[in-house]
């Protein structure tokens, strides 16, 4: 059967029919349906939503829709013993306490089971001591404190502002600095955009609003008790002491009203420079401790949260491929939310729902994709990407042999300015070509392509005339597919203007105020940006599942490998003397990149010229494309991060959200001048260069003619 026979209508017609079927009004309706009550992972409400989605996907026409469950470690506040922070006087009396909950938004006052703000997986504890303000608690912030300002955080409670990096990295850094507790807060400088009102009158964070979130450092492990294996009925579970990635000190988040009360009394050292000062009317002194009259007062944390093994549910829908049913294209996004999930995740889940509906309509008209499409509604993403990771662990053998691509579908919007895409270089050309065919939803770009508005508003920093596409990092459900399994992955959403809006994430992220009304009133009243994101995500899935030749371009990997090799070489050349002393050479890596470039171009020539009507040849060439991403996987993983196995990309060791290129070499070089044994440290650099060289060369060989 040829592809066109399998699909009954011409490919262009199919794609147009699929895109035309997507409707903004449906996305709006689905979003409203998904956001009326909280859907916290591990709760009955979220189980009911899983069953609802299962039922609707079946109605939409998928071949099968199953629930898969796992029993994973989750974390909840104690319902009768709330978490809070207090200022205590010298007699131990609490003279100030932080709020126990966020004031609920109008219309939601009677909603039950709104989980109060907490840091998921915080251990219990009641540390007390002096406060130290540590800015964003980034690696460089602690370097500034400890090395330049000679401030010791040992035995202190640190207070850090949210933003810039993943909160788990902040906690890890604080632990390493010897802190006994961490207070996280949202500074208006990062979460209150100038000229915009607070919710419910605008999209800014009110003073009582708080960002929830997990504070794990899982490094891709999934369920902390069953790393590497699915958390099923017969799984061996580690004890809590051996669990992966749990913080060892109490952590709690607060809003800026409460933060004001803690920070206004701060004494000790002044902040080192303006980059350490937020927008509150406080001095932003670093401490330690309170100033003058308040110097005898201390801060005390009261954390009583519990971690417990809890059942979670993924929904997995299948649309069987007509020609290559054993090749899987996956569209996945999570379903669990911290509270209502108006943006995160339901703006994404609503888009997935509409994409499923559109594919279902085509199927009902007799069409099938060439390859199998799997749709996933993941659970427990907010607790460490648990649902997706456990499912991938359970199905790893199938996925590594059959996985063509994974498209992520969390929040569809984090702003309404322009498109934002992170993906493997293999997908660059797919994304460019697709966005050239889609209409821009942006004001002032009527009748223009999405590619045009995206390029204008978010130009590539390196390549003029092209839009920016970023590296994949982590912090979302593509992690296991890309970083562990080496399945080509991508994500797309609408974003803010990063030039003018310096706030981190969107202001109401993970707060109770992330509601349907937030989206409908302030972000996307016409749901046109949601529709565009549906077209991009859906269009990518369609092309990946239906094109005869996979829409991957290995030449774009050659381009970025050259760029990344240049970048890491330039970093190492900040140490020219040591490079000489320890005979560190990048010649082999540059040679491997050149070989990759040459072989990729020859492969592309063969790809253009081969007989596409020969099914064996076609499958052979497609397999070379599919397995290229897999070829960048090192089975041994990165040092101390065995589940991050991609040699070209990994989440930054300093910020889980950000991607780092040649991470093994990068980490070996990081702060190398401070290493106690330089010979050993530069030996590790050389080892990492050799691993990278081998991997690039081996990947190149997979593109060579097979015989």
């Amino acid at each position: 059967k040829s592809s066109s026979e399998a699909t009954n209508i011409t490919p262009k017609h199919n794609m147009k029919a699929f895109l035309d079927e997507l409707k903004a009004e449906n996305i709006k309706k689905f979003l409203h349906n998904f956001t009326q009550i909280p859907h916290l992972a591990g709760t009955e409400q979220n189980f009911q939503l899983a069953k609802q989605i299962q039922s609707q996907w079946k109605e939409f026409g998928l071949d099968s829709v199953e629930l898969t469950h796992y029993d994973v470690l989750l974390s909840y506040p104690n319902k009768t013993h709330p978490n809070y922070i207090s200022i205590i006087n010298e007699d131990g009396n609490e003279i100030f306490n932080t709020s126990l909950f966020e004031p609920p938004p109008a219309g939601y006052e009677n909603v039950s089971d709104i989980v109060p703000p907490f840091s998921a997986f915080s251990p219990q504890g009641m540390p007390e001591g002096d406060l130290v303000y540590v800015n964003y608690a980034r690696t460089e912030d602690f370097f500034k404190l400890e090395r330049d300002m000679k401030i010791n955080c040992s035995g202190k409670i640190v207070i850090a502002r949210y933003g810039k990096v993943f909160r788990g990295n902040k906690v890890k850094n604080a632990q390493l600095a010897g802190a006994t507790g961490v207070i996280l807060y949202s500074d208006p400088d990062d979460y209150f955009a100038p000229g915009v009102k607070s919710y419910p009158d605008g999209w800014n964070l009110p003073g009582g609003g708080v960002q929830r979130g997990n504070i794990l450092n899982l490094n891709g492990a999934g369920d902390p008790l069953t790393p590497g294996y699915p958390a099923n009925e017969y799984a061996y579970r580690r004890g809590m002491a051996e669990a992966v990635g749990l913080p060892s000190i109490p952590v709690h988040p607060i809003g800026y009203y409460d933060a004001q009360k803690l920070l206004e009394k701060m004494g000790g050292s002044a902040s080192p420079d303006s980059s350490w000062r937020g927008s509150l009317k406080v001095p932003y002194n670093v401490g330690p401790g309170f100033t003058g009259n308040f110097s005898t007062q201390k801060v005390k944390m009261h954390i009583h949260s519990t971690s417990e093994v809890t059942r979670i549910y993924n929904v997995i829908g299948t649309l069987r491929g007509a020609v290559e049913p054993d090749r899987y294209v996956i569209l996945g996004g999570h379903r669990d939310s911290w509270v209502f999930g108006g943006i995160d995740p339901q703006s994404g889940a609503a888009v997935v729902h509409e994409i499923v509906r559109s594919f279902g309509m085509l199927k009902k008209e007799g069409w099938r994709p060439r390859r199998t499409i799997l749709f996933a509604s993941w659970d427990a993403e907010e607790f460490g990407l648990l649902g997706s990771t456990e499912w991938a662990e359970e199905n790893s053998r199938l996925l590594q042999e059959r996985g063509v691509a994974y498209i992520n579908a969390d929040s569809s919007i984090e702003g309404n300015y322009t498109l934002r895409v992170d993906c493997t270089p293999l997908m660059y050309s797919l994304v460019y070509n697709l966005t050239k065919e889609l209409e821009s939803p942006d004001e002032g770009f009527e009748g223009k392509s999405l590619y045009e508005s995206w390029t204008k508003k978010s130009p590539s920093p390196e390549f003029s005339g092209m839009p920016r596409i970023s590296k994949l990092g982590s912090g979302n459900d593509f992690e296991v597919f890309f970083q562990r399994l080496g399945i080509a992955s991508g994500r797309a959403r609408y974003t803010k203007n990063w030039e003018t809006n310096k706030f981190s994430s969107y202001p109401l992220y993970h707060s109770v105020y992330e509601t349907y009304e937030l989206v409908e009133k302030f972000y996307d009243p016409m749901f046109k940006y949601h529709l565009t994101v549906a077209q991009v995500r859906g269009g990518m899935v369609f092309e990946l599942a239906n094109s005869v030749v996979l829409p991957f371009d290995c030449r774009d990997y050659a381009v970025v490998l050259r760029k990344y090799a240049d970048k890491i070489y330039n970093i190492s050349m900040k140490h020219p003397q040591e490079m000489k002393t320890y005979s560190v050479s990048f010649d082999s890596l540059f040679s491997a990149v050149k070989n990759f470039t040459e072989i990729a171009s020859k492969f592309s020539e063969r790809l253009r010229d081969f007989d596409k009507s020969n099914p064996i040849l076609l499958r052979m060439m497609n397999d070379q494309l599919m397995f290229l991403e897999r070829a960048f996987i090192d089975p041994l993983g990165l040092p101390d991060r065995p589940f991050y196995r991609h040699v070209i990309y990994a989440p930054s060791s300093h910020n889980k959200y950000a991607g780092e290129s040649f991470p093994g070499i990068y980490d070996a070089l990081f702060d190398i001048e401070s290493k106690v044994d330089p010979s050993q440290a530069w030996g590790e650099v050389k080892r990492q260069i050799s691993i990278a060289t081998f991997t690039v060369q081996a990947a190149a060989e997979t593109l060579s003619e097979v015989a």
């Epitope: 092209m466 371009d553 774009d556 050659a558 090799a565 050349m573 470039t597 040459e598 020859k602 020539e605």
Partner: antibody, heavy 121, light 111 residues
């Protein structure tokens, strides 16, 4: 046999624009990085810009950044250089060159015969 | 001012050997592959050496290339009058993300 044929050169006033083309044949055009290299009268070679194979990432010399735009049409096997805000110092013979390795610039194994651009009032 | 430094001119008699040097830095010649081009009067440049020391087909073995550290050298033995031309070295610069050339060396075959 590989052939590169440039066209579009000529006399233009300072501040003016010109678009150069390079018609390529004899190889899989889309797979190779392509560059423009110029040579002012009596002077040496100066690399101007390159565009990668694949999705067409672009690179520019500092002297032309923001004024020149390189592009390619793989369906027509043609390379372009859009030159805006031209200055007297842009006067040169402009050569189109093919990379000998693949998608990013390593060395130029084939060169066109060149097209003369004169910027003068 | 070129990123790579070449002598402006060299000369030798027919049959003799000549070398042309090309000096750069760790970010260009130090890590990347060097190529050499010959430009006969009034013609387009032609590739002479690539990957430091490889010759394209059709280039006689009288021409050779080498690289050491941050310098490269083009050698021509058995000089012929037809070798009179400008010679350019070129490479990629990993800091500039750009192709860089030497200023060119004019070879004169005496006699």
């Amino acid at each position: 046999e590989v052939q590169l044929v440039e066209s579009g050169g000529g006399l233009v006033q300072p501040g003016g624009s010109l678009r150069l083309s390079c018609a390529a044949s004899g190889f899989t055009f889309s797979s190779y990085a392509m560059s423009w290299v110029r040579q002012a009268p009596g002077k040496g070679l100066e690399w101007v810009s390159a565009i990668s194979g694949g999705s067409g990432s672009t690179y520019y010399a500092d002297s032309v950044k923001g004024r020149f735009t390189i592009s390619r049409d793989n369906s027509k096997n043609t390379l372009y250089l859009q030159m805006n805000s031209l200055r007297a110092e842009d006067s040169a013979v402009y050569y189109c060159a093919k990379d000998g390795v693949g998608a990013t610039p390593y060395y130029f194994d084939y060169w066109g015969q060149g097209t003369l651009v004169t910027v003068s009032s | 001012q070129s990123v790579l430094t070449q002598p402006p001119s060299v000369s030798a008699a027919p049959g003799q050997k000549v070398t042309i040097s090309c000096s750069g830095s760790s970010s260009n010649i130090g890590i990347n592959y060097v190529s050499w081009y010959q430009q006969l009067p009034g013609t387009a440049p032609k590739l002479l050496i690539y990957d430091n020391n490889k010759r394209p087909s059709g280039i006689p073995d009288r021409f050779s290339g080498s690289k050491s550290g941050t310098s490269a050298t083009l050698g021509i033995t058995g000089l012929q009058t037809g070798d009179e031309a400008d010679y350019y070295c070129g490479t990629w610069d990993s800091s500039l993300s750009a192709v860089v050339f030497g200023g060119g060396t004019k070879l004169t075959v005496l006699g």
